[in-house]
Interface confidence: low
């Protein structure tokens, strides 16, 4: 009956709308319902327009072009033509009243069967039942395995392949280790497997920035270093660096009213020129403080250098040397004044003598036939130099002297002119200011070194060279090189250093040959008011520690190897450094920080005087050490 109705409708459509033109009302009579009419009529008008204009474009946007108006109009009511369903996913299409119904194949869904069902995402069958990889395909899916696995016969489960058994030479010289789905070629720590050469190669950890500052790679490992000269030490993680911290604060207060005489290792600290009436005579008054035994306090001379006067210290006593056209004299006298106390000193030219007083008591009177400095053109012109000579004058002196003097002067009055502008000059320059309180000893500020050239060879000794060292130390920082021997090839065949211990608030003393620690004296509380004493002897056969302390040492066999390295170095040229190292590579020693604190050194029975050093950093104090900072109620 339904098909009969369709045929009738088709006949009416032919008659009403193809053989003749129909309006929408006439079309409504054909279809007898609004939905089909509303669907049909706009498309009918498109067919008419296309054929009337002769420029036919498919009325239903189909890929099939209709040959004539009849075909175009007849196709309008069939909802399944052209096919609205997805060809891949549909099973059938059913025409309806201005609608259609697509029936989908298994694995497809949607009004037009346009959507693939993802079986791999089915919550009722997780991962499509696959044990590893589920691959969704249009309208279906299949299981697969990861690399290193094979599919079982059930097409769903996977099994691991043992590559190491399949190919025994898979890893070459490395060890093959099977792991799920793969294999690993294992190398010892510090080595990495090279696929091309099938071998283990050293890892350059340094190129991977393992260290915070400096890194040295070696086969199978690496070592981190920190720049001790910039005040860093290696942290406990052996990678990062931390600042070397103060363990014993010192009183570094200075006063500009106190002139420091050792500001320069070599050279004048202050130079003054006087132009006074010819009746003036030389005079100098000042307070003086030192622990040094020898050096120049002041040197005065005439403009033409022909006459001069030297006020110095020798053996702790005041020495005066003078020379002019009339006479040449040297006198030493008075009490020892290198006692660290302030002593008032005055030197005054009288009519027939030069009077030297200490604490206002005359200690020397030097006769002179005429004026010390000869006036010219009605003026007495005099140049005065503190703590040094203006040029090489050794040959002119009556008795040579080491000019370097670690001391301070205050309350000076030269040529009866008072302080006359000198204080203003000194006030500007911090390094000319003296410490308010000092003790006996030498002070290393942690910023420089002193160099000595010492002959360690003892001709009468069958052992050849020997080093006997006594150190008296009061460190202010817990890490630093105290004593080092450096070869001409920039190696450090012997060093004695301080390092902060792993145990809190204590220090270790390490003795090293090149970069190997041969002795470690553990956990000493060295950062205290008390000075610590360390004594040892070294020769080519032995290192003997004379201070009874807890020692950690390398094996005797290894010690002999290291002493052989030292012996070889000692047969060449070595320089001795106190307070740190010169420019050697960071990896040359286990410690490279400068020593900070007080220290006296005796080598082979000789107390080293820093005034006698080949070179010395200006900030090292040869004969004065800052006091320990004392906490006051206000601080």
């Amino acid at each position: 009956a339904n098909s009969m109705l369709e045929e009738t409708k088709q006949g009416n459509l032919e008659r009403e709308c193809i053989e003749e033109l129909c309006n929408k009302e006439e079309a409504r009579e054909v279809f007898e319902n609004d939905p089909e009419t509303d669907y049909f009529y706009p498309k009918y008008l498109v067919c008419l327009r296309s054929f009337q204009s002769g420029l036919f474009t498919a009325a239903r946007q189909s890929t099939d072009a209709y040959p004539d108006l009849r075909s175009c109009v007849n196709a309008i009511p069939d909802q399944c033509s052209p096919l609205p369903c997805n060809e891949d996913g549909y099973m059938s299409c059913k025409d309806g009243k201005a609608s259609f119904t697509c029936t989908c194949k298994p694995g497809w869904q949607g009004e037009k069967c346009e959507f693939d069902i993802n079986e791999c995402k089915d919550p009722s069958n997780i991962n499509g039942g696959c044990s590893q990889i589920c691959d969704n395909t249009p309208g279906s899916y299949h299981c697969s395995c990861k690399s290193g696995f094979v599919m079982l016969s059930n097409k769903k489960d996977c099994k691991d392949v043992d590559e190491c058994s399949l190919k025994p030479n898979m890893c070459g010289t490395a060890v093959c280790k099977n792991i799920p789905g793969d294999f690993e070629c294992e190398c010892p720590e510090g080595y990495r497997y090279n696929l091309k050469s099938k071998s283990c190669e050293d890892v350059d950890e340094c190129s991977e920035n393992m260290c915070a500052q400096l890194c040295v790679n070696y086969p199978g490992g690496y070592t981190c270093y920190c720049d001790g000269k910039k005040g860093f030490k290696l942290a406990q993680d052996q990678k990062s660096c931390e600042a070397v911290s103060v363990c014993l604060p010192l009183n570094l207060d200075t006063k500009y009213e106190l002139l420091y005489l050792a500001e320069q290792f070599a050279g004048v600290v202050l130079y003054l020129k006087f132009r006074l009436p010819e009746i003036s005579r030389f005079s100098a008054e000042f307070d003086f403080r030192t622990y040094d035994s020898q050096g120049v306090i002041l040197y005065a001379e005439s403009i033409d250098h022909s006459a001069w006067l030297l006020i110095a210290l020798r053996g702790g006593k005041i020495e005066v040397q003078l020379k002019n056209e009339h006479t040449s004299k040297i006198t030493t006298g008075g009490d020892i004044i290198n006692n660290g106390l302030w002593n008032m000193v005055s030197v005054e030219e009288l009519e027939h003598s030069i009077s030297i007083k200490i604490a206002k008591e005359a200690v020397m009177d030097i006769n002179k036939p005429g004026p010390l400095f000869k006036p010219e053109n009605g003026l007495l012109e005099t140049k005065v130099y503190f703590a040094g000579f203006p040029r090489k004058v050794e040959s002119e002196l009556i008795k040579p002297i080491n000019p370097r003097l670690d001391g301070c002067i205050r309350s000076w009055n030269l040529m009866k002119q008072g302080a006359s502008g000198i204080k203003e000059i000194i006030q500007e320059k911090q390094n000319k200011h003296c410490l308010v309180t000092v003790e006996k000893g030498s002070y290393y500020p942690g910023s420089g070194i002193a160099e000595f050239h010492i002959d360690y060879n003892n001709g009468s000794n069958a052992e050849g060279w020997h080093i006997n060292v006594t150190l008296n130390i009061r460190p202010s920082m817990g890490t630093g090189v105290m004593l080092a021997l450096v070869s001409s090839n920039n190696t450090v065949p012997f060093a004695v250093s301080l390092v902060d211990s792993t145990s809190e608030k204590s220090q270790d003393i390490v003795i090293s040959v090149e970069n190997t620690v041969i002795y470690r004296i553990q956990a000493l509380s060295l950062c205290s008011n008390q000075r610590s004493h360390l004594e040892f002897r070294v020769n080519r056969n032995n290192l003997e520690l004379l201070t009874p302390l807890k020692i950690e040492t390398i094996s005797q066999e290894e010690l002999q190897t290291q002493l052989a390295i030292l012996d070889k170095a000692m047969k060449g040229k070595v320089a001795t450094y106190l307070g740190g190292l010169p420019d050697v590579p960071f990896s040359a020693t286990p410690v490279n920080a400068f020593y900070n604190g007080c220290m006296e050194v005796n080598i082979n029975g000789v107390e080293l005087d820093l005034d006698e050093a080949i070179s010395k950093h200006n900030d090292i104090r040869a004969h004065s050490c800052p006091s320990v900072w004392k906490k006051t109620k206000n601080s």
């Epitope: 350059d204 790679n217 720049d227 050697v584 590579p585 960071f586």
Partner: antibody, heavy 122, light 108 residues
Framework: QVQLQQSGPGLVKPSQTLSLTCAIS??????????WNWIRQSPSRGLEWLGG?????????DYAVSVKSRIIINPVTSKNQFSLQLNSVTPEDTAVYYC????????????WGQGTLVTVSS | EIVLTQSPGTLSLSPGERATLSCRAS???????LAWYQQKPGQAPRLLIS???GRATGIPDRFSGSGSGTDFTLTISRLEPEDFTVYYC?????????FGQGTKLEIK
């Protein structure tokens, strides 16, 4: 990726001051594990390291002895840059100037600026 | 200062051949404080090797370095056309950090 971009004049008169700037991207001038350097290259002297600046809880500089008396290298932290000042230049200072990063505390140079040809001439 | 001497001054080879460049220091630069650079015309030097033997990031494995103390070698196992340019060594064991005078690698 670290990049260094140089800027500054290509012509300087004798006795005047040569000034160049190096802008850093991809790293910080205050990086505790880097050093920022200036290197120059001329046919007569080849490649020559001039100096560097680096930060290790405070700023440090180190300079080659050959130019120490007339060189200043400064960090400009606000702009993530560093600069070179070379005073009292002579025609001998004519060269291509490069800025470069020193890796960690090492002084090998893993990143370089594009180079600036500076001619000293009146 | 440490003086680095590179040899030969110029090396003429063909693509595919092996190149061996030498760098000698006037005194020890420490075990491995030596770097190698490649410089193409109009460009800044490019780091190839640091620590005497450690290849820098992105450097092909045909480049390798060896040596310690005072004698160092850069080897290019199979020369590619782009490898024909100038190579410098540099020591960073002690300040001032110095460079060699360079070796020019040219096509035979």
């Amino acid at each position: 990726q670290v990049q260094l971009q140089q800027s500054g004049p290509g012509l300087v008169k004798p006795s005047q001051t040569l000034s160049l700037t190096c802008a850093i991207s991809g790293d910080s001038v205050s990086n505790n594990n880097a050093a920022w350097n200036w290197i120059r290259q001329s046919p007569s002297r080849g490649l020559e390291w001039l100096g560097g600046t680096y930060y290790r809880s405070k700023w440090y500089n180190d300079y080659a002895v050959s130019v120490k008396s007339r060189i200043i290298i400064n960090p400009v932290t606000s702009k993530n840059q560093f600069s070179l000042q070379l005073n009292s230049v002579t025609p001998e200072d004519t060269a291509v100037y490069y800025c470069a990063r020193g890796s960690s505390w090492y002084r090998f140079f893993d990143y370089w600026g594009q180079g600036t040809l500076v001619t000293v001439s009146s | 200062e440490i003086v680095l001497t590179q040899s030969p001054g110029t090396l003429s080879l063909s693509p595919g051949e092996r190149a061996t460049l030498s760098c000698r220091a006037s005194q020890s630069v420490g075990s491995s404080y030596l770097a190698w650079y490649q410089q193409k015309p109009g460009q800044a030097p490019r780091l190839l090797i640091s620590g005497a033997s450690g290849r820098a990031t992105g450097i092909p494995d045909r480049f390798s370095g060896s040596g310690s103390g005072t004698d160092f070698t850069l080897t290019i196992s199979r020369l590619e056309p782009e490898d024909f340019t100038v190579y410098y060594c540099q020591q960073y064991g002690s300040s001032p950090y110095t460079f060699g005078q360079g070796t020019k690698l040219e096509i035979k």
